[in-house]
Every structure is written in C-alpha cells, then in structure tokens.
Interface confidence: low
C-alpha cells in the first residue's frame, strides 16, 4: 500500500532511501525543455520475485522541440496525485549500496531527467536523514523515518534529528513558519530539502542495517 504523505521534513536536513521496497514507484520526470516520450511509461516500478528485485520500465525523455528523438515528460496532474518526493538530485550517487531482499537499488539516472526525483513510497519504507553542510545534529536518536500503517492510515514515524548551525542557537523544530511544499500542499516541516547538483552522498551500511553512517562530500 502506498504511503499517504511525504516523509517528514527536518529543517536543514535531507533524506535518502538506501533501497526501495517492492511496489515503490518513481515518476519519470524530465528537466525543463524535455518531456516523456509518448509511448514511455509515466513511472518506474520496483518489482521482483523471491530472489531478485529490479525497476520495471525505463524513463525516456525527448526534447520538447524535437518530435522524433528519444528522451520524457513531467507527469500530468492526474499522474502527480499523491506524489512522493525525495527532493534530492539525480546526480546523487549511493556508494556501496546494499542489496536487501525485496528492495530495489537507487535507479541509475536517465538522460535529461529532472533534478528532483519523485517517489511513491510504500508501507515499510525507511528513509534516512542527515544534516546539510554547515549544520550539525543537535541530539542523537533514530535519524530515520519509517512509513507505517496505524489505525488503517499510513504515517511516517518522526526522525529524532535537529540540525543546528555551528554558530546559531539551537532551533526547535516548528518554530519557523513552514513553507509550501513543491506540489502546493502544506508540508509537515519547515525545511527546504532541495540540494544543489554538486551534492553527493555516500553511505556505508552495516550488514544488519542497525547503524547507518552518512559521509558527505562537497565539491
């Protein structure tokens, strides 16, 4: 079952999935000036059997000006319904990605894809958070969020991460006025998770997935 909302946003933090549960959909979004080819799928779907999971369909974008070259389009409004976004760049690379049963890895980038990847997560998905450059974690706790089913509704658990500037007083979440989310709906937190395209993230994941260490490179 799809999660009803986006993962919570944490001020001055970004989130990332290490792997995507089967059933996850990724919208085939194209950057400005490009659109999805007419015969192309509107999304990629993580599917699998007992031994292997992979992304069905491929995203292809074509130049809005050109008629016959292969390449993709921003989904129509109906395709954007209940859209999920990581608001992280496609250039982001996940190093040493683990293989988890029933999960797909981060899909490789496609030509002329949009800078923002929009996922439709499913119940049971976990995403991990880290503070952005220039901010540090104010206190420890599970810096992750899991989409869970509660009372027949889906809800993301709340990551215990507060990111504060080295020279700033600590900011308690929610004291800023939240900004509108990319799709125009109010969001659950106050942060801007969109990052620049030179942001890269590497992860080292213990085999048990009990500990998750983010190492970030900025170039």
């Amino acid at each position: 079952e799809l999660c009803d909302d986006d993962p919570p946003k944490i001020t001055h933090a970004t989130f990332k999935a290490v792997a995507y549960k089967e059933g996850t959909m990724l919208n085939c979004e194209c950057k400005r000036g490009f659109r999805r080819i007419k015969s192309g799928s509107p999304y990629m779907l993580c599917t699998g059997n007992s031994s292997h999971s992979s992304w069905d369909n491929q995203c292809q974008c074509t130049s809005s000006a050109a008629r016959n070259t292969t390449k993709q389009v921003t989904p129509q409004p109906e395709e954007q319904k209940e859209r999920k976004t990581t608001e992280m760049q496609s250039q982001m690379q996940l190093a040493d990605q683990v293989s988890l049963p029933g999960h797909c890895r981060e899909p490789p980038p496609w030509e002329n894809e949009a800078t923002e990847r929009i996922y439709h997560f499913v119940v049971g998905q976990t995403v991990y958070y880290q503070c952005v450059q220039g901010y540090r974690a104010l206190h420890r706790g599970p810096a992750e969020s899991v989409c869970k089913m509660t009372h027949g509704k889906t809800r993301w658990t709340q990551p215990q991460l507060i990111c504060t500037g080295e020279t700033e007083p600590s900011q308690f979440p929610g004291e800023e006025e939240p900004q509108a989310s990319p799709d125009g709906l109010p969001e659950s937190e106050t942060s801007r998770l969109v990052t620049t395209t030179d942001f890269r993230i590497q992860t080292e994941v213990a085999a048990t997935m009990e500990t998750f260490i983010f190492t970030t490179e900025y170039q």
Epitope: D5, I10, R140, P142, T150, R155, Q158
Partner: antibody
C-alpha cells in the same frame, strides 16, 4: 507568540454532541501536526486524535467512529466534533501542537467536557 | 500499546533538594521520551524531549537521562515553582501514551 485557545466545552447528556474549537495564533495550523489530548482523573492524559499537515487523521480506539478532527485553514482553527458522547468521555480536552516528533510543545488552556444525565 | 509507569506516584521534598523521578516503558523506546510539568488548572508544559534535550526556556536545573526502557527526570535544586505533577510520555509508536504522573509536594 504561539497561542492556542480552546472553546466549546460544556455539559451534555449521554448520546449528545459537542464541537470543540481551538483557535491558533503565531503559527499556521495547516502546516503543523495538531492533536487533541484529554485528561481525566481516572485515565490521566490520553491522545484522542491528531491531524497532520497532509490531512491524515487518526483516532484513539475509544473514540474512533464517534469523534472527527478537522481544521479550517482560513480561520487557522482546529476542531473536534464529538458525537454519541459517553460518560467516560468526561474530561478536560486540550488541543496541542506536535513538534513533528510526537512531542507536544504548545498546549491550549483546556476546555471541560462533562457528559452526564 | 506501550505502557509507561512512573515512580514514585508522589514525592515530598523541600526547596533546594535534588529530586529524581523515574519512568519505565513496557518495551524499548530508544530515547523517544518527553517529560511534562503540570500545575493545577493549567495545561502540561514540555520540559524535556528526546529523553535528555531541554526544551527552550526551561531552566537548566531540569535534566533528563535514560534510553531504552528506563528514564529519569532530575531537578537539581528544587525551587518553589517546581512543585507540580510531572508526566512522562513515549513518542516512539502509536498510540502515544503517558505515564500516570508523579506529584511533587512540599515537605
């Protein structure tokens, strides 16, 4: 300054209805997780219902199907519609803002609901 | 549901005393715990979140510790305004649950 002010409590007979309101200032209700928490001498503090920014709602088992949480974004107000009230619903009802981590950082002053014949 | 049990249910102390209140969760909740102070006729007030993080504006004589199932709220030097009822609350999973409260009285 963040402020929450509840109203709408009172005496009602079993089976009756009440609508509680919580007027918020200093922040935007629609952009936050909002909850109703009630307090009774017997059961203590109990989370009754919550609604968060995406509009998802949830209810305690004891009130599901009878209570409805909602909000009016234009009035920056949270509501709790309580139907089929029972004696055990007698409590002080607080609206509270969730700090996004299931902690309640701001509370209203509370409004007393008494269900009695 | 996760049950939260506080002890003692009431405690008498004097101004200047160091007071400790404990809270035990029926299952592990990592550090997903908050402490609230409530005075008669008033709403609860958040003191500590994430087990040990002090809420903005709360005096530093309040501190929290613990992880997993056992947690402690400590008031290092009681002030007259600290006499109240204190509640713990787990924030790990739904339904969110509170302890039954510990009443701190003047000796």
């Amino acid at each position: 300054e963040v402020q929450l002010v509840e109203s709408g409590g009172g005496l009602v007979q079993p089976g009756g209805s009440l609508r509680l309101s919580c007027a918020a200032s200093g922040f935007t209700v629609s952009s936050n997780y909002m909850s109703w928490v009630r307090q009774t001498p017997g059961k203590g503090l109990e989370l009754v219902s919550f609604i968060y920014s995406g509009g998802i709602t949830s209810y305690a088992d004891s009130v599901r199907g009878r209570f409805t949480i909602s909000r009016d974004n234009s009035k920056n107000t949270l509501y709790l519609q309580m139907n089929s009230l029972r004696a055990e619903d007698t409590a002080v009802y607080y609206c509270a803002r969730d700090d996004y981590s299931n902690y309640f950082d701001y509370w209203g002053q509370g409004t007393l609901v008494t269900v009695s014949s | 549901d996760i049950q939260m049990t506080q002890s003692p249910s009431s405690v008498s102390a004097s101004v200047g005393d160091r007071v400790t209140i404990t809270c035990r969760a029926s299952q592990g909740i990592s550090n997903w715990l908050a402490w609230y102070q409530q005075k008669p006729g008033k709403a609860p007030k958040l003191l500590i979140f994430a087990a040990s993080s002090l809420q903005s504006g709360v005096p530093s004589r309040f501190s929290g510790s613990g992880s997993g199932t056992d947690f402690t709220l400590t008031i290092s030097s009681l002030q007259p305004e600290d006499f109240a009822t204190y509640y713990c609350q787990q924030a790990k999973s739904f339904p969110i649950t509170f302890g039954q409260g510990t009443r701190l009285e003047i000796k």
